[in-house]
Interface confidence: medium
């Protein structure tokens, strides 16, 4: 069957996000992928969106992330814009209202996004074949 347009948008956003490091992509987030054996796909998407929302809510105006230079400022604002878009699209794909995120494990935002990109690409290859 056809791949969801939302899925294509997510992969596109993730490609943009993982291309460019910012001052805060090394900050840690909850690693929901560490022990996701008994988790449905929809729950994974929902929990990923929750983690991203927590991140940008905490760090949108974090001056450590905004940096000192004009370039750092705009890179961070672009990161936040992409994370919000990703959050919105993941919620749409998940179709769930809320989901618990209780894991103790942490990973950097950069690694989290790379892992999410791998999962999304796998999903895309399945639905496009």
């Amino acid at each position: 069957h056809k791949c969801d347009i939302t899925l294509q948008e997510i992969i596109k956003t993730l490609n943009s996000l993982t291309e460019q490091k910012t001052l805060c992509t090394e900050l840690t987030v909850t690693d929901i992928f560490a022990a996701s054996k008994n988790t449905t796909e929809k729950e994974t998407f929902c929990r990923a969106a929750t983690v991203l929302r927590q991140f940008y809510s905490h760090h949108e105006k974090d001056t450590r992330c905004l940096g000192a230079t004009a370039q750092q400022f705009h890179r961070h604002k672009q990161l936040i814009r992409f994370l919000k878009r990703l959050d919105r699209n993941l919620w749409g794909l998940a179709g769930l209202n809320s989901c618990p995120v209780k894991e103790a494990n942490q990973s950097t935002l950069e690694n989290f996004l790379e892992r999410l990109k791998t999962i999304m690409r796998e999903k895309y290859s399945k639905c496009s074949s």
Partner: nanobody
Framework: EVQLLESGGGLVQPGGSLRLSCAAS????????MAWVRQAPGKGLEWVSW????????YYADSVKGRFTISRDNSKNTLYLQMNSLRAEDTAVYYC?????????WGQGTLVTVSS
């Protein structure tokens, strides 16, 4: 043609105040975020403050937080920076910049000197 014209700079004593203005023309001012950026003598460019198109969301660099206030009047196509409790380290040329994914247009700048 985009034009940004800063004014209001000058010599002020430490602890004093200044209000910078930036008159914008050549683009639809109300549709764009705007910023103040400064360059101290012998230093690189440092962003100072940013405001969204509607004037509801603002950002400040740590170095000016609590002392500077950015605002805008979309009916007058003007951006402002109220600077209070000025310090010697605030001495710089202050530029207003149009913000569209990056600071894509700059004014000529206005010099602020804080000295006793």
């Amino acid at each position: 043609e985009v034009q940004l014209l800063e004014s209001g700079g000058g010599l002020v004593q430490p602890g004093g105040s200044l209000r910078l203005s930036c008159a914008a023309s050549g683009f639809t001012f109300r549709n764009y975020g705007m910023a103040w950026v400064r360059q101290a003598p012998g230093k690189g460019l440092e962003w100072v403050s940013w405001i969204d198109a509607s004037g509801t969301e603002t950002y400040y660099a740590d170095s000016v937080k609590g002392r500077f206030t950015i605002s805008r009047d979309n009916s007058k196509n003007t951006l402002y920076l109220q600077m209070n409790s000025l310090r010697a380290e605030d001495t710089a040329v202050y530029y207003c910049a149009k913000s569209h994914g990056r600071f894509d247009y700059w004014g000529q700048g206005t010099l602020v000197t804080v000295s006793s």
